[in-house]
């Protein structure tokens, strides 16, 4: 697009991941400029003709927006003057993955930065004691993952032990035919021990912990995005 201003301004983006079917954010910041009407933000995607989003003269201009992003994008308009050009993306799709460019023009100059956006599915695992089994077992379930993750079990007492022989993991395709439900059962568990179910793909890593004692069951889950 046409550039005015002789200087280059610093534009910063962060590699991020989007969860299919959820809403995501593509992060981009730039040197602030109090003159809102002089700020132009353009988001582009490699391989796509037209724009992902454009914001100029204090408002959106979606006249050049590509059809695949229709009704799905917004900038944080009240934060543009403080240098936030991040883009909200509704209902993230697998096809949204790729290289995006955040172009900025202000009265101070112009600049741009690329962002690698990964898409997949990731969710928190939940571990429960499976009382239906013939022997005491644990059931780890996570509703939405893509691509297919690896699942591993660990135990605080038996550190370094390989539980693959005493566990069974299955992947069930969800109704939208992309994401999958992960179910892993660990057999022959012992009481007064903490077990961890770890689910990981190239986008995220999730861990569910469960501590089973005579008197109580304690659970904890965490999710970490990789390379973000």
């Amino acid at each position: 697009f046409g550039i005015s201003g002789k200087h280059f301004i610093t534009v910063t983006t962060f590699t991020s991941a989007g969860n299919i079917g959820e809403d995501g954010t593509l992060s981009c910041t730039f040197e602030p400029d109090i003159k809102l009407n002089g700020i132009v933000i353009q988001w582009l995607k490699e391989g796509i003709k037209g724009l992902v989003h454009e914001f100029k003269e204090g408002k959106d201009d979606l006249s050049q927006q590509h059809e695949m992003f229709r009704g799905r994008t917004a900038v944080f308009a009240d934060q543009v003057v403080v240098g936030n050009a991040s883009l909200r993306l509704k209902n993230v799709q697998l096809t949204d993955a790729g290289t995006y460019t955040c172009y900025i023009r202000t009265s101070k100059g112009k600049g741009n930065a690329n962002l690698e956006y990964k898409t997949g599915a990731f969710s928190m695992p939940e571990i429960n004691v499976d009382y239906n089994a013939s022997s005491e077992s644990l059931r780890c379930e996570a509703p939405r993952w893509f691509p297919q993750p690896t699942v591993a079990w660990a135990s605080q007492v038996d550190q370094g032990a390989n539980f693959s022989e005493v566990s069974n993991t299955s992947f069930e395709l969800n109704s939208e035919n992309v994401t999958m439900k992960v179910v892993s059962v660990l057999y022959n568990v012992t009481i007064n021990n903490t077990y961890s179910c770890m689910i990981e793909n190239d986008i995220a890593k999730a861990t569910g912990d469960i501590k089973v004692t005579d008197s109580e069951v304690k659970r904890r889950s965490q999710l970490q995005l990789l390379n973000s």
Epitope: G21, E22, D23, T73, N91
Partner: antibody, heavy 120, light 107 residues
Amino acid sequence: QLQLQESGPGLVKPSETLSLTCTVSGGSIKSGSHYWGWIRQPPGKGLEWIGNIYYSGSTYYNPSLKSRVTISVDTSKNQFSLKLSSVTAADTAVYYCAREGSYPNWLDPWGQGTLVTVSS
Amino acid sequence: EIVMTQSPATLSVSPGERATLSCRASQSVSSNLAWYQQKPGQAPRLLIYGASTRATGIPARFSGSGSGTEFTLTISSLQSEDFAVYYCQQYHSFPFTFGGGTKVEIK
């Protein structure tokens, strides 16, 4: 304060084309952060989203009506229009126009609606 | 398309009481949900968007909650002007779709 007003014939014959216009006042149809939509409501029933248009002319239609619907815009008159072809009695409804957020895509405000009856 | 289901179809409540309306989506719509109020002979009016954000000028007695597939509109203390039909609408994916509505009537 933004206002929308639907206008057009209240009676259309079966197999003909229903044509309605929505006039926007108190604001510009060229607002960058909004689409302009049509919604209908058969008597005593629920709401059905028909489609929307951006001031530049790009449209999106409900697939269930896509083959029969055309939405157009006239920025010089601050108006947008709906055409629905090959109508039947099932198209009898109150037709509303509304401003639609580009995202979040809420509908606000709405026109007061106009009843279109399809009958010979 | 995403199917929106509202319950109950009719809710009989006395003025001053609390009303709880439910809306369920056939698949996750994240927080991309709006609530509208419609009185007889009038156009719908936006109450809530983003599942929980009140639109401009909407009284604090209206509140929305939920995400994913289960949503609730709560009217904390019903006023006479609140008796109407309420619709939920998802704008998560095209085509945008509405629930069948819940009629809140005087008990």
